[in-house]
């Protein structure tokens, strides 16, 4: 197991998850850790505890390894980091990778007030309700935006969007969370259509690949609950 020595360390590796950082309960996920060509061992940590290791074969000169989680559950949802060793030195820790399990327990209801088709500039509020009491609700927009909003609430939360712009149009879903990394089933999608303005088009952007499997978000939220602009479709945490 890795020994902490702060004196001499190698650059931190990059960690990411495929196909997504949001994984349906029971499904598999790959966690990739990219270090150096010379790495002799990679170690994966989960919530600060040693989780897995891989020793690349010398014959295969690779600078990354894949850790496979065969069945995602609430017990494997949380924060992952990785390290690598080259010679006698260990790297610094990668940035944290936050894996969320979805598809737990119950399905929330999502609706929009005053209606799903509104005029540019109109005030819109999303409501998410879940019979099972949860601590927090998340509202996510498919594609087109990397913003997640979260609100605390017992069985219902409201998400005021303010006066809407064309950027607000699209398809939304909400989740109830039992903790930050264990979420309910997704709600049925609600598509917000914006009419009026110069480009008079009420069509929401269509994308054949737009589905939960293609969502990627960095789940760090600021105090207001609105996500910082730091999502990548490959969820590569690097900086």
């Amino acid at each position: 197991q890795r020994i902490n020595t702060e004196k001499e360390t190698l650059p931190k590796p990059i960690i990411w998850a495929k196909p997504s950082i949001m994984v349906t309960n029971g499904n598999s996920v790959n966690i990739w850790c990219q270090g150096a060509q010379s790495a002799s061992e990679y170690q994966l940590y989960f919530e600060g505890s040693f989780f897995a290791l891989e020793r690349p074969k010398p014959s295969r000169s690779m600078n990354k390894v894949r850790f496979f989680i065969s069945q995602m559950t609430s017990h494997t949802a949380g924060i992952y980091t990785c390290f690598y060793q080259s010679g006698e030195l260990w790297s610094k820790s990668s940035n944290p990778l936050k894996l969320v399990v979805t598809g737990l327990y119950d399905t929330p209801n999502l609706w929009v007030y005053p209606r799903p088709e509104v005029t540019l500039g109109e005030n819109v509020t999303f409501f998410c309700q879940l019979k099972t009491a949860t601590s927090k609700f998340f509202l996510l927009k498919e594609r087109g935006s990397n913003h997640i909003q979260n609100k605390y609430g017992n069985i219902q939360a409201e998400f005021p969007m303010g006066p809407v712009t064309r950027a607000h149009r699209g398809t939304y879903r909400c989740f109830g969370s039992y903790n930050d990394y264990a979420w309910s089933f997704p709600s049925e999608p609600v598509t917000l259509l914006i009419t009026g303005g110069v480009e008079n088009s009420s069509l929401a952007p269509t994308d054949p690949t737009s589905s939960l499997d293609y969502w990627e978000f960095d789940l760090s939220t600021n105090e207001s609950g609105l996500q910082k602009d730091s999502a990548f479709w490959d969820h590569t945490t690097q900086n």
């Epitope: 989780f51 390894v65 894949r66």
Partner: nanobody, 127 residues
């Protein structure tokens, strides 16, 4: 579906040896990473040893390093734990576990990674 059945437990004197076996049913054994865990009375389950699916990579808890050896026979769908120089503190129920499927040479140390577990076999070390 994978079923794991441990055997080989029993009572042994300090300094003695035992070999535990874990027989796996199903055709997926060759693609499974395997591990041994143990749980002493009143304590949490702890990692003992693990082996990658390709046989040639192993990892041990510091407490058993140099005394225990994990191995596997993919032809027999069996993983083994050879235990020697046994101590009183090795007394526990020993569980075999599998990660099915897996890739590469992943070795899993954390119990949460394992998706199949055996019922356990009791090892008692006493004079």
């Amino acid at each position: 579906e994978v079923q794991l059945v441990e055997s080989g437990g029993g009572e042994v004197q300090p300094g003695g040896s035992l070999r535990l076996s874990c027989a796996a049913s199903g055709r997926t054994f060759a693609s499974a990473a395997m591990g041994w865990f143990r749980q002493a009375p009143g304590k949490e389950r702890e990692f003992v040893a693990a082996i990658s699916r390709s046989v040639d990579d192993t990892y041990y808890a510091d407490s058993v390093k140099g005394r225990f050896t994990i191995s596997r026979d993919n032809a027999k769908n069996t993983v083994y734990l050879q235990m020697s120089s046994l101590r009183a503190e090795d007394t526990a129920v020993y569980y075999c576990a599998a990660v099915v499927p897996t890739y590469g040479n992943n070795i899993y140390v954390h119990s949460a990674a394992y998706n199949y577990w055996g019922q356990g076999t009791l090892v008692t070390v006493k004079p």
